[in-house]
């Protein structure tokens, strides 16, 4: 608010007032009269820059008059009372109401005193964020989408992620005239490492007290990535039975595990139990390449592991033997 002048009457009002589309707003405007100063006010006038005539007048004897009587109202001025408060209420704010307004006091003996107020017409946007489920493509694709609908002015959308990625933001007119819908896509080359990770869409707007944060959990569909664990290159005859595990990462989840060898079906000492393969004790050395084949909705992938059971030394080693 501008500081009052010294020794003179001054009109006090904010330089800018925000109002929401469709709502009502009060344009505050007061005459500040220093203690020793005497003033008499006979008229209050509101006019809009660029338009001919005044939109609202409060006259000392005639009372209030409005260019649009259903949309305007002096909130405090009353006939027979001192006219020091020219605050004007506007109902049913429209986009075209945005602009500069002059609040003016006709005073004696100072003459007229006025101030300009900028009315900002805002519309609070609705925000949504959603994952764009993708498959491995080898090139950048939208992986998340953030939409801020019906904002005025347009919302600002930014993305926050440790994964890199590039935003692609566009605007289209909103459903209500003068509003804007902003869509931002977060683009990255899909990989299995990204699946299940989070990115955050940050939406900023004049109407928000603080930015809105919307988290998106990324989804990348990919065929199984397979490895076999449980073998330490150190298996010997006479050691306990052992278990190999077929480790598969995939999205969607694996639908089937199939164990085999490079020679065909599993030998008798190997028993498949889903993702696990039980290796029973053997009484002679073996050298076999095992294959685990994992299937999901996108395809099948396999891993191979060559297992050797050697003649041998110390019984302290874990390994394969009959108890």
């Amino acid at each position: 608010w501008p500081p009052p002048g010294t020794g003179d009457v001054v009109v006090q009002a904010p330089t800018q007032v925000p109002g929401f589309l469709g709502d009502s707003v009060t344009l505050p405007c007061y005459l500040q009269v220093p203690n020793m100063e005497v003033t008499h006010v006979s008229q209050l006038t509101w006019a809009r820059h660029g338009e001919s005539g005044s939109m609202a007048v409060f006259h000392q004897t005639q009372g209030p008059s409005y260019s649009e009587s259903k949309r305007l109202e002096f909130v405090a001025a009353r006939l027979g009372a001192e006219l020091r408060n020219a605050s004007l209420r506007m109902f049913g704010l429209r986009v075209e109401d945005e602009g500069n307004y002059t609040c003016l006091f006709v005073t004696f003996p100072q003459g007229s005193r006025s101030v300009d107020i900028w009315l900002r017409v805002l519309a609070k946007p609705q925000n949504t964020a959603e994952v764009q489920k993708v498959q491995l493509t080898g090139e950048p694709v939208p992986m998340a989408r953030c939409v801020s609908t019906g904002g005025r002015p347009p919302a600002q959308i930014t993305w926050h992620s440790d994964l890199g990625g590039m935003p692609n933001t566009s605007q289209v007119p909103g459903f209500l005239s003068g509003t804007v819908t902003v869509t931002s896509l977060w683009i990255l080359v899909p990989s299995s490492q990204v699946d299940g990770k989070n990115v955050t869409c940050k939406v900023e707007h004049e109407s928000f007290e603080k930015p809105q944060l919307l988290t998106v959990n990324l989804t990348v569909y990919y065929p199984p990535e397979v490895s076999i664990s449980g073998y330490d290159n150190n298996w010997y005859l006479g050691q306990n039975e052992a278990t190999l595990t077929c480790d598969a990462r995939s999205n969607p989840e694996p639908t089937g595990y199939n164990w085999s060898t490079t020679m065909g079906p599993l030998p008798p000492f190997a028993v498949a139990q889903g993702a696990q393969l039980l290796i029973r004790p053997v009484d002679k050395p073996i050298n076999t390449t095992l294959i685990c084949n994992v299937t999901n909705a996108l395809g099948a992938r396999q891993a191979e592991l060559t297992v050797q059971v050697k003649e041998g030394p110390p019984s302290e080693h874990s390994g394969i033997s009959r108890n």
Partner: antibody, heavy 116, light 107 residues
Framework: EVQLVQSGSELKKPGASVKVSCKTS????????MHWVRQPHGKGLEWIGG????????SYNQRFKGRVTITVDKSTSTAYMELSSLRSEDTAVYYC?????????WGQGTLVTVSS | DIQMTQSPSAMSASVGDRVTITCKAS??????VAWYQQKPGQPPKALIY???YRYSGVPDRFSGSGSGTDFTLTISSLQAEDLAEYFC?????????FGQGTKLEIK
């Protein structure tokens, strides 16, 4: 009913003074500023000055500064305009008018003639 | 001082005619303009305030418009009783000033 009733016509010699009165009724005298406007015969209107009855605060047209004095008597709800050092070009009808930014009520006018 | 230049200075029109009187201010006066009607031998009577608002009791054939420096008083359908002189006045700043008047005669 708002009424502003002015004193009668005056014939004055150049150099003399004239004091015109304006008695009001039908409204609260102290709530409205009272102004004086003059109109030479067949000519336009000229604002002289005004006074707020409550505070006694005045504002004068620079053209009359030093020659005009506007006063009020709150007890009788009457405003006065005194013009001194009269000259022939001061011959005009003098009106009191209630101020509402514009002037919504006027007295009937007082003809002041300055002639030797 | 702000000059108020009125035109025309005199005009005649017939009953039923649309009459327009203009007033030009030498500087911006916003909408702080009033219009008065003065019949012969009478004081002025307020018609319009704040450039476009009619005083109560004033017939709606009288209308005012304008802001800034250019103002208009319109009589939409002239009546015989509208024979008078019309003045504009600015009350944006002191000293208040008036137009020189437009004398309206009935043909």
């Amino acid at each position: 009913e708002v009424q502003l009733v002015q004193s009668g016509s005056e014939l004055k010699k150049p150099g003399a003074s004239v004091k015109v009165s304006c008695k009001t009724s039908g409204y609260t005298f102290t709530e409205y500023t009272m102004h004086w406007v003059r109109q030479p015969h067949g000519k336009g209107l000229e604002w002289i000055g005004g006074i707020h009855p409550n505070s006694g605060e005045t504002s004068y047209n620079q053209r009359f500064k030093g020659r005009v004095t506007i006063t009020v008597d709150k007890s009788t709800s009457t405003a006065y305009m005194e013009l001194s050092s009269l000259r022939s070009e001061d011959t005009a009808v003098y009106y009191c008018a209630r101020w509402t930014g514009d002037f919504d009520y006027w007295g009937q006018g007082t003809l002041v003639t300055v002639s030797s | 001082d702000i000059q108020m230049t009125q035109s025309p200075s005199a005009m005649s029109a017939s009953v039923g005619d649309r009459v327009t009187i203009t007033c030009k201010a030498s500087q911006n006066v916003g909408t702080n303009v009033a219009w008065y009607q003065q019949k012969p031998g009478q004081p002025p009577k307020a018609l319009i305030y704040s450039a476009s608002y009619r005083y109560s009791g004033v017939p709606d054939r009288f209308s005012g418009s304008g802001s800034g420096t250019d103002f208009t008083l319109t009589i939409s359908s002239l009546q015989a009783e509208d024979l008078a002189e019309y003045f504009c006045q600015q009350y944006e700043s002191y000293p208040y000033t008036f137009g020189q008047g437009t004398k309206l005669e009935i043909k």
